[in-house]
Protein backbone atom coordinates (compact mmCIF):
# COMPACT_ATOMS: atom_id res chain seq x y z
CA UNK A 1 0.00 0.00 0.00
CA UNK A 2 2.75 2.21 0.82
CA UNK A 3 4.84 1.36 -2.28
CA UNK A 4 1.66 1.80 -4.49
CA UNK A 5 1.20 5.25 -2.78
CA UNK A 6 4.52 6.47 -3.39
CA UNK A 7 4.29 4.74 -7.02
CA UNK A 8 1.10 7.20 -7.38
CA UNK A 9 2.81 9.95 -6.58
CA UNK A 10 5.75 9.77 -8.61
CA UNK A 11 3.68 9.09 -11.49
CA UNK A 12 1.65 11.94 -11.35
CA UNK A 13 4.90 14.17 -10.76
CA UNK A 14 6.48 12.97 -14.19
CA UNK A 15 3.10 13.92 -15.52
CA UNK A 16 3.96 17.67 -14.78
CA UNK A 17 7.17 17.16 -16.59
CA UNK A 18 5.87 15.30 -19.85
CA UNK A 19 5.30 18.50 -21.35
CA UNK A 20 8.66 19.78 -21.82
CA UNK A 21 10.38 16.83 -21.00
CA UNK A 22 8.98 13.57 -22.62
CA UNK A 23 12.31 11.41 -21.26
CA UNK A 24 13.91 11.96 -17.77
CA UNK A 25 17.13 9.97 -17.18
CA UNK A 26 17.27 9.04 -13.43
CA UNK A 27 19.71 7.90 -10.67
CA UNK A 28 18.98 6.28 -6.96
CA UNK A 29 20.18 8.60 -4.87
CA UNK A 30 22.03 7.41 -1.67
CA UNK A 31 20.96 3.59 -0.70
CA UNK A 32 17.00 4.33 -0.01
CA UNK A 33 15.41 2.80 -3.41
CA UNK A 34 12.58 5.10 -2.71
CA UNK A 35 14.87 7.92 -4.07
CA UNK A 36 15.53 9.22 -7.03
CA UNK A 37 16.92 12.52 -8.71
CA UNK A 38 16.47 13.06 -12.68
CA UNK A 39 17.26 15.01 -15.15
CA UNK A 40 15.93 15.31 -18.78
CA UNK A 41 17.07 13.83 -21.35
CA UNK A 42 19.90 14.64 -23.04
CA UNK A 43 20.41 16.71 -19.89
CA UNK A 44 23.81 16.39 -17.92
CA UNK A 45 23.73 16.31 -14.14
CA UNK A 46 26.40 17.78 -11.59
CA UNK A 47 25.68 18.00 -8.09
CA UNK A 48 21.73 19.08 -7.44
CA UNK A 49 21.76 20.40 -10.81
CA UNK A 50 20.63 19.71 -14.73
CA UNK A 51 22.57 21.44 -17.82
CA UNK A 52 21.69 21.67 -21.34
CA UNK A 53 23.73 23.01 -23.94
CA UNK A 54 21.53 24.54 -26.37
CA UNK A 55 23.07 24.91 -29.82
CA UNK A 56 21.13 27.32 -31.62
CA UNK A 57 21.62 31.35 -31.53
CA UNK A 58 19.51 33.18 -30.08
CA UNK A 59 20.26 36.65 -28.34
CA UNK A 60 20.16 36.74 -24.58
CA UNK A 61 16.58 37.44 -23.93
CA UNK A 62 15.21 34.80 -26.63
CA UNK A 63 18.03 32.31 -24.64
CA UNK A 64 16.95 32.75 -21.08
CA UNK A 65 13.08 32.31 -22.32
CA UNK A 66 13.65 29.12 -24.19
CA UNK A 67 15.08 27.77 -21.28
CA UNK A 68 12.35 29.07 -18.94
CA UNK A 69 10.11 27.78 -21.49
CA UNK A 70 12.04 24.43 -19.85
CA UNK A 71 11.49 24.70 -17.06
CA UNK A 72 15.15 26.11 -16.28
CA UNK A 73 16.85 29.68 -16.78
CA UNK A 74 19.77 30.31 -18.43
CA UNK A 75 23.54 29.27 -16.08
CA UNK A 76 24.14 30.24 -12.96
CA UNK A 77 27.88 29.55 -12.00
CA UNK A 78 28.56 29.40 -8.12
CA UNK A 79 31.65 27.22 -7.84
CA UNK A 80 35.09 26.54 -10.00
CA UNK A 81 33.76 22.83 -9.69
CA UNK A 82 30.86 23.76 -11.42
CA UNK A 83 32.65 25.53 -14.40
CA UNK A 84 35.32 22.75 -14.13
CA UNK A 85 32.16 20.43 -15.00
CA UNK A 86 30.22 22.65 -17.40
CA UNK A 87 32.74 23.42 -19.46
CA UNK A 88 33.62 19.66 -20.41
CA UNK A 89 30.45 19.73 -22.73
CA UNK A 90 31.36 22.97 -24.88
CA UNK A 91 32.98 23.29 -27.87
CA UNK A 92 35.94 25.67 -27.86
CA UNK A 93 35.31 27.42 -30.97
CA UNK A 94 32.19 28.67 -29.34
CA UNK A 95 30.78 31.27 -27.20
CA UNK A 96 28.03 30.62 -24.67
CA UNK A 97 25.71 32.68 -23.02
CA UNK A 98 25.43 33.01 -18.79
CA UNK A 99 22.47 33.78 -16.77
CA UNK A 100 24.44 36.85 -16.10
CA UNK A 101 23.56 40.67 -17.01
CA UNK A 102 24.32 44.24 -16.13
CA UNK A 103 20.80 45.86 -17.91
CA UNK A 104 21.36 49.23 -16.55
CA UNK A 105 24.80 49.38 -17.95
CA UNK A 106 26.49 50.39 -14.61
CA UNK A 107 28.03 47.21 -13.35
CA UNK A 108 25.48 45.87 -11.39
CA UNK A 109 25.77 42.58 -12.79
CA UNK A 110 22.88 40.21 -11.59
CA UNK A 111 22.31 36.44 -11.89
CA UNK A 112 19.01 35.80 -13.67
CA UNK A 113 17.90 33.41 -10.41
CA UNK A 114 18.46 36.37 -8.04
CA UNK A 115 21.27 34.72 -6.51
CA UNK A 116 23.57 37.64 -4.81
CA UNK A 117 26.64 38.42 -7.39
CA UNK A 118 29.78 37.57 -5.66
CA UNK A 119 32.99 39.56 -6.96
CA UNK A 120 34.83 37.01 -5.56
CA UNK A 121 32.88 33.73 -7.41
CA UNK A 122 33.50 35.16 -10.92
CA UNK A 123 35.56 33.72 -13.47
CA UNK A 124 35.83 36.83 -16.13
CA UNK A 125 38.56 36.57 -19.14
CA UNK A 126 41.86 39.45 -18.32
CA UNK A 127 40.16 42.72 -18.93
CA UNK A 128 36.57 42.30 -18.82
CA UNK A 129 33.93 43.07 -18.29
CA UNK A 130 35.25 46.19 -20.68
CA UNK A 131 32.33 47.76 -22.16
CA UNK A 132 29.33 48.96 -20.97
CA UNK A 133 27.29 48.71 -23.73
CA UNK A 134 28.31 45.14 -23.72
CA UNK A 135 25.52 43.90 -20.91
CA UNK A 136 25.60 40.41 -21.12
CA UNK A 137 27.66 37.49 -20.26
CA UNK A 138 29.40 34.87 -22.31
CA UNK A 139 31.79 32.15 -21.65
CA UNK A 140 34.63 31.16 -24.12
CA UNK A 141 37.84 29.42 -24.57
CA UNK A 142 40.96 32.09 -24.91
CA UNK A 143 44.06 29.86 -25.79
CA UNK A 144 46.00 32.04 -22.94
CA UNK A 145 43.30 31.49 -20.47
CA UNK A 146 41.39 28.83 -21.15
CA UNK A 147 37.20 29.20 -20.37
CA UNK A 148 36.37 32.20 -18.96
CA UNK A 149 33.86 35.17 -18.82
CA UNK A 150 33.64 37.93 -21.41
CA UNK A 151 30.78 41.06 -21.82
CA UNK A 152 29.06 40.72 -24.73
CA UNK A 153 26.01 42.96 -26.62
CA UNK A 154 22.71 40.65 -25.44
CA UNK A 155 20.89 41.25 -29.04
CA UNK A 156 24.22 39.30 -30.43
CA UNK A 157 23.01 35.41 -31.03
CA UNK A 158 25.18 32.84 -29.40
CA UNK A 159 24.68 29.56 -28.19
CA UNK A 160 23.90 29.00 -24.33
CA UNK A 161 23.57 26.90 -21.65
CA UNK A 162 20.17 26.25 -19.22
CA UNK A 163 20.28 24.76 -15.56
CA UNK A 164 17.42 23.54 -14.01
CA UNK A 165 17.14 21.93 -10.36
CA UNK A 166 17.35 18.35 -10.38
CA UNK A 167 13.66 16.18 -10.65
CA UNK A 168 13.25 14.49 -7.29
CA UNK A 169 10.66 11.42 -7.16
CA UNK B 1 25.77 69.46 -30.15
CA UNK B 2 26.09 66.08 -32.17
CA UNK B 3 26.73 65.72 -35.69
CA UNK B 4 26.97 62.85 -38.11
CA UNK B 5 28.14 63.96 -41.59
CA UNK B 6 28.28 62.10 -44.35
CA UNK B 7 30.29 61.77 -47.65
CA UNK B 8 31.52 59.72 -50.42
CA UNK B 9 27.99 58.72 -51.81
CA UNK B 10 27.57 58.79 -55.80
CA UNK B 11 26.47 57.49 -59.11
CA UNK B 12 28.47 54.22 -59.94
CA UNK B 13 27.72 51.15 -62.18
CA UNK B 14 26.64 47.75 -61.20
CA UNK B 15 29.82 45.88 -59.56
CA UNK B 16 31.72 48.90 -59.19
CA UNK B 17 32.47 50.27 -55.75
CA UNK B 18 32.09 53.23 -53.24
CA UNK B 19 33.12 54.13 -50.23
CA UNK B 20 31.10 55.85 -47.65
CA UNK B 21 32.11 58.25 -45.13
CA UNK B 22 31.05 59.40 -41.46
CA UNK B 23 32.56 62.38 -39.77
CA UNK B 24 30.92 62.78 -36.25
CA UNK B 25 31.29 65.86 -33.42
CA UNK B 26 29.96 67.06 -30.71
CA UNK B 27 30.18 63.53 -28.71
CA UNK B 28 32.95 60.54 -27.53
CA UNK B 29 32.74 59.14 -30.89
CA UNK B 30 34.97 56.19 -29.37
CA UNK B 31 32.20 55.26 -26.64
CA UNK B 32 29.39 54.65 -29.30
CA UNK B 33 28.08 52.18 -31.24
CA UNK B 34 27.24 53.36 -35.18
CA UNK B 35 25.33 51.87 -37.94
CA UNK B 36 24.40 52.69 -41.51
CA UNK B 37 20.57 52.87 -41.87
CA UNK B 38 19.28 53.06 -45.93
CA UNK B 39 16.56 54.21 -47.62
CA UNK B 40 16.07 53.46 -51.22
CA UNK B 41 12.97 55.76 -53.48
CA UNK B 42 9.80 56.48 -51.86
CA UNK B 43 10.30 53.34 -49.52
CA UNK B 44 11.32 52.78 -45.53
CA UNK B 45 14.33 52.51 -43.36
CA UNK B 46 16.43 49.27 -43.90
CA UNK B 47 19.33 48.59 -41.12
CA UNK B 48 22.40 48.09 -43.32
CA UNK B 49 25.24 47.57 -40.70
CA UNK B 50 26.40 47.55 -36.87
CA UNK B 51 29.98 48.16 -35.32
CA UNK B 52 30.38 48.28 -31.74
CA UNK B 53 32.33 51.25 -29.88
CA UNK B 54 35.48 48.57 -29.14
CA UNK B 55 35.38 47.54 -33.19
CA UNK B 56 35.06 43.34 -31.48
CA UNK B 57 32.17 43.05 -33.37
CA UNK B 58 30.38 43.92 -36.77
CA UNK B 59 27.13 42.72 -38.05
CA UNK B 60 25.50 42.96 -41.25
CA UNK B 61 21.85 41.15 -42.67
CA UNK B 62 22.23 38.96 -45.90
CA UNK B 63 21.42 41.37 -48.06
CA UNK B 64 25.12 43.06 -48.29
CA UNK B 65 27.09 40.06 -46.00
CA UNK B 66 30.53 39.90 -47.86
CA UNK B 67 29.82 43.02 -50.09
CA UNK B 68 30.10 45.71 -47.98
CA UNK B 69 32.53 46.29 -44.94
CA UNK B 70 32.15 48.90 -41.96
CA UNK B 71 34.69 50.04 -40.05
CA UNK B 72 35.77 52.72 -37.58
CA UNK B 73 38.39 54.69 -36.86
CA UNK B 74 38.39 56.18 -33.41
CA UNK B 75 41.28 58.55 -33.97
CA UNK B 76 39.82 60.43 -36.53
CA UNK B 77 36.12 60.32 -34.95
CA UNK B 78 34.82 58.83 -38.39
CA UNK B 79 32.65 55.83 -39.76
CA UNK B 80 33.29 54.39 -43.04
CA UNK B 81 31.28 51.84 -45.40
CA UNK B 82 33.14 50.13 -48.07
CA UNK B 83 30.67 48.90 -50.62
CA UNK B 84 31.63 46.34 -53.40
CA UNK B 85 29.83 44.55 -56.06
CA UNK B 86 27.41 47.31 -56.15
CA UNK B 87 24.04 46.35 -57.27
CA UNK B 88 20.35 48.66 -58.08
CA UNK B 89 18.97 47.60 -55.73
CA UNK B 90 21.17 49.49 -53.51
CA UNK B 91 20.75 52.57 -54.46
CA UNK B 92 19.30 54.51 -51.96
CA UNK B 93 19.85 57.05 -49.33
CA UNK B 94 22.57 56.19 -46.56
CA UNK B 95 22.62 57.27 -43.45
CA UNK B 96 24.96 56.95 -40.33
CA UNK B 97 23.30 56.53 -37.07
CA UNK B 98 24.66 56.34 -33.39
CA UNK B 99 23.34 54.02 -31.15
CA UNK B 100 22.57 54.43 -27.67
CA UNK B 101 21.84 51.35 -25.48
CA UNK B 102 19.06 50.65 -23.28
CA UNK B 103 18.51 47.97 -20.97
CA UNK B 104 19.10 44.79 -23.31
CA UNK B 105 19.00 46.33 -26.54
CA UNK B 106 19.73 49.62 -28.03
CA UNK B 107 18.04 52.56 -30.46
CA UNK B 108 19.17 55.45 -32.95
CA UNK B 109 19.11 58.24 -31.03
CA UNK B 110 21.46 60.75 -33.61
CA UNK B 111 21.22 60.62 -37.51
CA UNK B 112 23.11 62.35 -40.30
CA UNK B 113 21.67 63.57 -42.96
CA UNK B 114 22.16 61.02 -45.49
CA UNK B 115 24.32 60.81 -48.72
CA UNK B 116 22.65 59.52 -51.83
CA UNK B 117 24.22 56.22 -53.77
CA UNK B 118 22.79 55.54 -57.35
CA UNK B 119 24.12 52.19 -58.81
CA UNK B 120 22.98 52.63 -62.61
CA UNK B 121 24.44 51.83 -65.76
CA UNK C 1 14.31 38.25 -38.01
CA UNK C 2 11.21 39.80 -36.22
CA UNK C 3 9.02 41.36 -38.43
CA UNK C 4 7.47 44.44 -37.65
CA UNK C 5 3.84 45.15 -39.32
CA UNK C 6 2.38 49.15 -39.03
CA UNK C 7 -0.99 49.88 -39.82
CA UNK C 8 -2.43 52.07 -40.97
CA UNK C 9 -0.34 52.39 -44.04
CA UNK C 10 -1.32 56.45 -44.16
CA UNK C 11 -3.97 58.27 -42.46
CA UNK C 12 -4.89 61.65 -42.71
CA UNK C 13 -6.35 64.02 -39.71
CA UNK C 14 -7.92 67.10 -39.20
CA UNK C 15 -5.74 69.71 -36.46
CA UNK C 16 -6.40 68.74 -32.93
CA UNK C 17 -7.67 65.31 -33.61
CA UNK C 18 -6.07 62.54 -32.66
CA UNK C 19 -3.87 59.98 -34.57
CA UNK C 20 -3.03 56.75 -33.52
CA UNK C 21 -0.64 54.48 -35.60
CA UNK C 22 -0.18 50.48 -34.15
CA UNK C 23 3.21 48.43 -34.50
CA UNK C 24 2.44 44.71 -34.47
CA UNK C 25 6.01 42.63 -33.94
CA UNK C 26 5.92 38.52 -35.32
CA UNK C 27 7.46 38.23 -31.39
CA UNK C 28 7.49 39.42 -28.37
CA UNK C 29 10.21 42.35 -28.09
CA UNK C 30 9.97 42.36 -24.76
CA UNK C 31 11.37 41.54 -21.71
CA UNK C 32 10.89 41.60 -17.79
CA UNK C 33 9.06 45.26 -18.33
CA UNK C 34 11.61 46.13 -20.44
CA UNK C 35 9.99 46.56 -24.11
CA UNK C 36 12.38 47.12 -26.72
CA UNK C 37 10.55 48.87 -29.28
CA UNK C 38 11.21 52.49 -30.81
CA UNK C 39 9.52 55.23 -32.47
CA UNK C 40 11.01 57.67 -35.54
CA UNK C 41 9.66 60.38 -37.35
CA UNK C 42 10.92 61.25 -40.93
CA UNK C 43 9.75 64.65 -42.88
CA UNK C 44 10.25 64.69 -46.24
CA UNK C 45 14.32 65.09 -47.41
CA UNK C 46 15.29 64.89 -44.29
CA UNK C 47 16.77 62.37 -41.98
CA UNK C 48 14.84 60.30 -39.27
CA UNK C 49 14.11 61.89 -35.98
CA UNK C 50 13.98 60.06 -32.63
CA UNK C 51 10.63 60.45 -30.89
CA UNK C 52 9.74 57.49 -28.55
CA UNK C 53 12.44 54.87 -27.11
CA UNK C 54 11.63 51.77 -25.35
CA UNK C 55 7.55 51.74 -26.00
CA UNK C 56 7.21 54.98 -23.42
CA UNK C 57 9.68 57.21 -23.07
CA UNK C 58 9.19 60.29 -24.80
CA UNK C 59 12.95 61.68 -25.96
CA UNK C 60 14.20 64.84 -24.97
CA UNK C 61 12.99 67.69 -26.66
CA UNK C 62 9.79 65.80 -28.14
CA UNK C 63 6.73 67.27 -27.40
CA UNK C 64 4.50 65.87 -25.27
CA UNK C 65 1.38 65.93 -27.67
CA UNK C 66 3.72 62.15 -28.53
CA UNK C 67 3.15 59.09 -26.60
CA UNK C 68 3.92 55.18 -26.82
CA UNK C 69 2.02 52.33 -25.57
CA UNK C 70 2.36 48.61 -25.42
CA UNK C 71 4.39 45.51 -24.55
CA UNK C 72 5.13 42.00 -25.92
CA UNK C 73 3.69 42.49 -29.38
CA UNK C 74 1.41 45.38 -30.16
CA UNK C 75 2.82 48.94 -29.62
CA UNK C 76 0.79 52.12 -30.52
CA UNK C 77 1.88 55.64 -31.03
CA UNK C 78 -0.35 58.23 -30.29
CA UNK C 79 -0.30 62.11 -31.60
CA UNK C 80 -3.19 63.88 -29.75
CA UNK C 81 -3.68 66.82 -30.18
CA UNK C 82 -2.18 66.82 -34.13
CA UNK C 83 -0.49 70.10 -35.34
CA UNK C 84 -0.09 70.40 -39.01
CA UNK C 85 3.89 70.10 -38.43
CA UNK C 86 2.84 66.71 -37.69
CA UNK C 87 2.32 65.73 -41.08
CA UNK C 88 5.58 63.15 -41.47
CA UNK C 89 6.10 59.46 -42.23
CA UNK C 90 6.14 57.02 -38.75
CA UNK C 91 8.23 54.10 -37.99
CA UNK C 92 8.75 51.72 -35.32
CA UNK C 93 12.17 49.90 -34.81
CA UNK C 94 13.01 46.56 -32.65
CA UNK C 95 16.16 45.81 -30.94
CA UNK C 96 15.96 43.32 -28.98
CA UNK C 97 17.76 40.73 -31.20
CA UNK C 98 19.44 41.29 -34.10
CA UNK C 99 19.30 41.71 -37.03
CA UNK C 100 17.49 45.38 -35.78
CA UNK C 101 14.21 45.73 -37.96
CA UNK C 102 11.95 48.82 -38.79
CA UNK C 103 8.30 48.66 -39.81
CA UNK C 104 7.17 49.33 -43.42
CA UNK C 105 6.11 53.33 -42.34
CA UNK C 106 2.99 55.13 -42.01
CA UNK C 107 2.36 58.74 -43.38
CA UNK C 108 0.34 61.03 -41.91
CA UNK C 109 -1.25 63.57 -43.63
CA UNK C 110 -3.04 66.81 -42.48
CA UNK C 111 -6.62 67.44 -43.51
Known amino acids: NFMYSKTVKRLSKLREYQQYHPSLTCVMEGKDIEDWSCCPTPWTSFQSSCYFISTGMQSWTKSQKNCSVMGADLVVINTREEQDFIIQNLKRNSSYFLGLSDPGGRRHWQWVDQTPYNENVTFWHSGEPNNLDERCAIINFRSSEEWGWNDIHCHVPQKSICKMKKIYI | EVQLVESGGGLVKPGGSLRLSCAAS????????MSWVRQAPGKGLEWVSTISSGDSYTYYPDSVKGRFTISRDNAKNSLYLQMNSLRAEDTAVYYC??????????????WGQGTTVTVSS | DIVLTQSPASLAVSPGQRATITCRASESVSFHGTHLMHWYQQKPGQPPKLLIY???NLESGVPARFSGSGSETDFTLTINPVEANDAANYYCQQSIEDPPTFGGGTKVEIK
Open chain 2, 26 to 33: GFTFSSYG
Open chain 3, 54 to 56: AAS
Open chain 2, 97 to 110: ARQLYYSYGYYFDY
